[in-house]
C-alpha cells in the first residue's frame, strides 16, 4: 500500500488537519492541571499523575497506553533531620544557619510535600573547614586557582556559583581538586535579569529561591545500580560503593541571601579578574577562609539525605502505523518535577498532551500514520534521565532495529524571544522546511513565517539567511536514544535573547517559584509560544511518521563533518612541533569525510530518482537513511564513557549540557601540554583519529549502492 491508500487522506491535508487541531487554550488548561501539586519522582503524587495521563491518552484514542515501572536509585532529604550550612565560631557554636526551605509563593502556603532544596545524591556528612570561592567551578576555573594562583582546595569546602556548566561537572571538578564539600549558590549576575522584578512580581529569582538538582556524573549509565540493563523485577544491583556516578563529598544548594552571608566574610586572595565577580555586594575574594576579624570562624555542612531504591513509572502510548508498524517515531518528555514544574517539565508535558489529543482526533476520523508513533511520559528525569534510560535499556534490541527518530519534549519555553533547535544534521532540512510553513508568533512578525523570525533573531554563524541549529549535548531524555543507541534525535523550545540576557537558563529554574502563574503571567499569557512549540514538535513527529521517504538529508551530515574535522585539526595544530615529532596526521579523517561527501551526494541523487511505488526499494532507501545515525555508533564507546557511543557527538566532558564534536579526539587533545607522558598522550590522539576516520568511512559505505 502507498501512504495515501493507508491513510485515506492526502498527506498535505493530514498535516494541516493535525496542526489546526492544536489549541493554545488546551495547552494552558493541561499546564494548569499538571502544576497544582508537586510531582517529585518516586512519590504517590507522581504515580497518580502517571495513571491520569495513561487514562487520558486512552481517551484521546491511542491504540494502547501502558505503565512501565523500574526500581531505581533516588535520593531524598531526611524529613526529621534537615540539611543546612552553618558558620561556626571557635567554640563550635553555630552563629549563622542557612534557611531550611524556600518561602512558599502566594497561594501555595498550605501545599504539603514541597521537597526542600537539596542536591540529589549528595552523600551524608558534616564537614567543616575554610571556604574557597571557585567561581563557576569549571575546569578552567580550577586551572586558574591551582596553576595561576597556587591556591590549594584540598581539605577545603568550596563555594561555586550555578551557571555555565552542568552542576555535576562542578562537583566532579571540586572532588578532583580535593575539596571536602561543595556549596552551590545562585548569583544574581546569572539569575537576576536587570529591570525585572523578583517573583511573584516578575520572573526573577528572589533571594530565598534555590535551584535543586542532581549532582551525578552518570555519563549515560541510567540507574546507578544497574548500568547497561533495566532495573526490573529480577535486577542484580551493585552495592552502593560500586554505584555509577555518585559524588563522594557532601553538596548543598543555597540562595543568594544565604550566599551573601558566607561570601561577605571571605578573605585571602582577591578575585583574579572581573569574570570572577558576580552582582552581590561582596568582594568575591577567593580565600581560603574568612578575613581578619572572622578568621577563626569556619563553615560546617550538615547533610542527612538518603539514597533509596524507589519505584518509578513511565507512561508509554502507541499509535500503530498503517504501512510500517515496525518503524518507530518517538515523542518523549518527562513528567517528574522538583516542585510544581511550571516550566520544567510541565510546559513540555502539556504540549505533548495536546499533540497526543490531536493525533487521537485524526485517528478517530479514520486516519493512521504510515509509521508507528510512540509517546512517552518519562519519570525520574531530574534524578539522572532514569526513566527514559531504563526503558531504552529494556527495549534496546527493538529500538536499534526499528527506531527512526526521537523528538524530545521537556520545557517548551525558557524565554519568549525566538525558537531554539538542537538536532542531528539529518533533521536540518526537515526543521527548515517545517518552520517555513508555520506562522511566527513573534511581535513585529505578523504574517511572517517562523523561519523568518527565527533566522532574523538567531542567525546561523556560518550560513547567511539560515537560522542557528545547535549540536545535541545531554542533560535531557534524548541522551540514551542519540548518544547510546544512535537514533536520529532533535529538540525544540522557545528561548530568551542570549545577546541581552546573560543569565544561565531561566532565573526560577528548579525552584519552588516555577509555577503555573509564572508562565501565565510573565512568559506566555496567550500560550502562543507554547502553541508554536507544539506545532514544531508535533510537525516534526508528523513528517517523520508519515512522509513516504524519510525527511533526512545525509548531505547536511557531510557539511558538518567537514566543519568538525577542520575544527579539531585547528585545535591539534596549536601543537605543530608535537604533531611533527609524533607523526600525527589527519589525512585519514579528511579522506573519509571527502568520501562521505561524495557518497552522500550520489545517494541523494538516487533518492530523487528511484521508483517510490516499489515498496521493497522504498523500504531499502529508507532503511539506509534510518541506519545512517546508527552507523556513527562505536560499540566500544568513548574512553571511560562506555554509554557515550556516538563518534561524532558526545556531551562535553567539562559540561554535560554542551555537545562536543569528534569528542574522542577532542578529549585526547585537551590539556595535552600538561600530560606527564607526551608520547602516550599523542599516541592516544592518533588512535582517536583512526577511530573517527574509520567510523566516518564505515558510515559512508552504508549509503553506497547495496550491490
Amino acid at each position: 500500500k502507498s501512504s495515501n491508500e493507508a491513510t485515506n487522506i492526502t498527506p498535505k491535508h493530514n498535516m494541516k488537519a493535525f496542526l489546526d487541531e492544536l489549541k493554545a487554550e488546551n495547552i494552558k488548561k493541561f499546564l494548569y492541571n499538571f502544576t497544582q501539586i508537586p510531582h517529585l519522582a518516586g512519590t504517590e503524587q507522581n504515580f497518580q499523575l502517571a495513571k491520569q495521563i495513561q487514562s487520558q491518552w486512552k481517551e484521546f484514542g491511542l491504540d494502547s497506553v501502558e505503565l512501565a515501572h523500574y526500581d531505581v536509585l533516588l535520593s531524598y532529604p531526611n524529613k526529621t533531620h534537615p540539611n543546612y550550612i552553618s558558620i561556626i565560631n571557635e567554640d563550635g557554636n553555630e552563629i549563622f544557619n542557612t534557611s531550611l526551605f524556600e518561602p512558599p509563593p502566594p497561594g501555595y502556603e498550605n501545599v504539603s510535600d514541597i521537597v526542600p532544596p537539596f542536591s540529589a545524591f549528595s552523600p551524608q556528612g558534616m564537614p567543616e573547614g575554610d571556604l574557597v570561592y571557585v567561581n563557576y567551578a569549571r575546569t578552567e576555573d580550577f586551572f586558574k586557582l591551582e596553576r595561576d594562583m597556587k591556591i590549594n582546595c584540598s581539605g577545603k569546602i568550596v563555594i561555586a556559583r550555578y551557571g555555565k556548566v552542568f552542576r555535576g561537572n562542578k562537583v566532579k571538578n571540586a572532588q578532583l581538586a580535593g575539596a571536602k564539600g561543595v556549596i552551590l549558590y545562585s548569583d544574581p549576575a546569572d539569575y537576576f535579569a536587570p529591570g525585572v522584578k523578583s517573583y511573584p512580581d516578575g520572573w526573577n529569582l528572589p533571594g530565598g529561591g534555590v535551584q535543586r538538582g542532581n549532582i551525578l556524573n552518570l555519563n549515560g549509565a541510567g540507574d546507578p545500580l544497574t548500568p547497561g540493563y533495566p532495573a526490573n523485577e529480577y535486577a542484580y544491583r551493585r552495592g552502593i560503593a560500586e554505584a555509577v556516578g555518585l559524588p563522594s563529598i557532601p553538596v548543598h544548594p543555597i540562595g543568594y541571601y544565604d550566599a551573601q552571608k558566607l561570601l561577605e566574610k571571605m578573605g585571602g586572595s582577591a578575585p583574579p579578574d572581573s569574570s570572577w565577580r558576580g552582582s552581590l555586594k561582596v568582594p568575591y575574594n577567593v580565600g581560603p577562609g574568612f578575613t581578619g576579624n572572622f578568621s577563626t570562624q569556619k563553615v560546617k555542612m550538615h547533610i542527612h539525605s538518603t539514597n533509596e531504591v524507589t519505584r518509578i513509572y513511565n507512561v508509554i502510548g502507541t499509535l500503530r502505523g498503517a504501512v510500517e508498524p515496525d518503524r518507530y517515531v518517538i515523542l518523549g518528555g518527562h513528567r517528574d518535577s522538583w516542585v510544581f514544574g511550571g516550566i520544567d517539565p510541565q510546559s513540555g508535558a502539556a504540549v505533548v498532551h495536546e499533540i497526543v489529543r490531536s493525533f487521537g482526533t485524526l485517528k478517530k476520523e479514520g486516519w493512521r500514520p504510515r509509521r508507528t508513533i510512540l509517546f512517552a511520559s518519562w519519570d525520574a528525569e531530574e534524578f539522572g534521565l532514569l526513566g527514559s534510560t531504563e526503558w531504552a535499556e529494556e527495549n534496546s534490541r527493538l529500538l536499534q532495529e526499528r527506531g527512526v527518530a526521537y523528538i524530545n519534549a521537556d520545557s517548551s519555553i525558557e524565554g519568549n524571544y525566538t525558537l531554539r533547535v538542537d538536532c542531528t544534521p539529518l533533521m536540518y532540512s526537515l526543521v527548515h522546511n517545517l518552520t517555513k510553513e508555520l506562522k511566527s508568533p513573534d511581535e513585529g512578525f505578523e504574517g511572517k513565517s517562523l523561519y523568518e523570525s527565527w533566522t532574523k533573531k538567531s542567525p546561523s554563524p556560518e550560513f547567511s539567511g539560515m537560522p542557528r541549529i545547535s549540536k545535541l549535548g545531554s542533560g535531557n531524555d534524548f541522551e540514551v536514544f542519540f548518544q547510546r543507541l544512535g537514533i536520529a534525535s532533535g529538540r525544540a523550545r522557545y528561548t530568551k535573547n542570549w545577546e541581552t540576557n546573560k543569565f544561565s537558563g531561566y532565573p526560577l529554574y528548579h525552584s519552588v517559584y516555577e509555577t503555573y502563574e509564572l508562565v501565565e503571567k510573565f512568559y506566555d499569557p496567550m500560550f502562543k509560544y507554547h502553541l508554536t512549540v507544539a506545532q514544531v514538535r508535533g510537525g516534526m513527529v508528523f513528517e517523520l511518521a508519515n512522509s513516504i521517504v524519510l525527511p533526512f538529508d545525509c548531505r547536511d551530515y557531510a557539511v558538518v563533518l567537514r566543519k568538525y574535522a577542520d575544527k579539531i585539526y585547528s585545535i591539534s595544530m596549536k601543537h605543530p612541533q608535537e604533531m611533527k615529532t609524533y607523526s600525527v596526521s589527519f589525512d585519514s579523517l579528511f579522506s573519509a569525510v571527502k568520501n562521505f561527501t561524495e557518497i552522500a551526494s550520489k545517494f541523494s541523487e538516487r533518492l530523487q530518482d528511484f521508483d517510490k511505488s516499489n515498496p521493497i526499494v522504498l523500504r531499502m532507501m529508507n532503511d539506509q537513511l534510518m541506519f545512517l545515525e546508527r552507523a556513527f555508533i562505536d560499540p566500544l564507546g568513548l574512553p571511560d564513557r562506555p554509554f557515550y557511543r556516538h563518534v561524532i557527538y558526545a556531551p562535553s566532558s567539562h559540561n554535560k549540557y554542551a555537545g562536543e564534536s569528534f569528542p574522542g579526539i577532542y578529549d585526547a587533545l585537551f590539556d595535552i601540554e600538561s600530560k606527564v607522558d607526551p608520547s602516550k598522550a599523542w599516541g592516544e590522539v592518533k588512535r582517536q583519529i583512526y577511530v573517527a576516520a574509520f567510523t566516518v568511512q564505515a558510515a559512508a559505505e552504508t549509503l553506497s549502492e547495496v550491490a
Epitope: 504517590e44 531524598y76 524529613k79 539514597n307 531504591v309 519505584r311
Partner: nanobody, 127 residues
Framework: QVQLQESGGGSVQTGGSLRLSCAAS?????FSWIGYFRQAPGKEREG???????????YYADSVKGRFTISRDNTENTISLEMNSLKPEDTGLYYC????????????????????WGQGTQVTVSS
C-alpha cells in the same frame, strides 16, 4: 502470598543486647522498605528502624540512634535488628513491617507507609 515472620525476642537486663530477625517469604521483590515498629503497653505503635531493601539506606527513631542497627541479607531475604545498651523504655511488642514497592512513603519511618505486618515478638528489658 507475602509473609513476614519475626524471631528473636526475649527478656534481658538493662544494658543487655538482643537480636531480632524478620524473614520475608513470598514475592519479596515487591518490598521497598522493611523495618521494625514497637508498641509499649498503653502507648501507640512507633517506628524504630527501617531499611531500604534495594540499597540499604536506613532511618532510625532518635530514641534508638547509636544503640540499634538494622541490616539486610538479601540472599536470605532477612532483616535483622541488633539492639544494644537496652533500656526499660525499649520494652514492648516489636513488629516487622514491609512496604510494597508502589511509591515512596513521604516518611519511611511512619507506620501508615507499611501494608504488611508480622505477628510481633515481645522484648522485655528489666532493671
Amino acid at each position: 502470598q507475602v509473609q513476614l515472620q519475626e524471631s528473636g525476642g526475649g527478656s534481658v537486663q538493662t544494658g543487655g543486647s538482643l537480636r531480632l530477625s524478620c524473614a520475608a517469604s513470598g514475592y519479596t521483590a515487591s518490598f521497598s522498605w522493611i523495618g521494625y515498629f514497637r508498641q509499649a503497653p498503653g502507648k501507640e505503635r512507633e517506628g524504630v528502624a527501617v531499611i531500604n531493601v534495594g540499597v540499604g539506606s536506613t532511618y532510625y527513631a532518635d530514641s534508638v540512634k547509636g544503640r540499634f542497627t538494622i541490616s539486610r541479607d538479601n540472599t536470605e531475604n532477612t532483616i535483622s535488628l541488633e539492639m544494644n545498651s537496652l533500656k526499660p523504655e525499649d520494652t514492648g511488642l516489636y513488629y516487622c513491617a514491609g512496604s510494597l514497592r508502589w511509591s515512596r512513603p513521604p516518611n519511611p519511618i511512619s507506620e501508615d507507609a507499611y501494608n504488611y505486618w508480622g505477628q510481633g515478638t515481645q522484648v522485655t528489658v528489666s532493671s
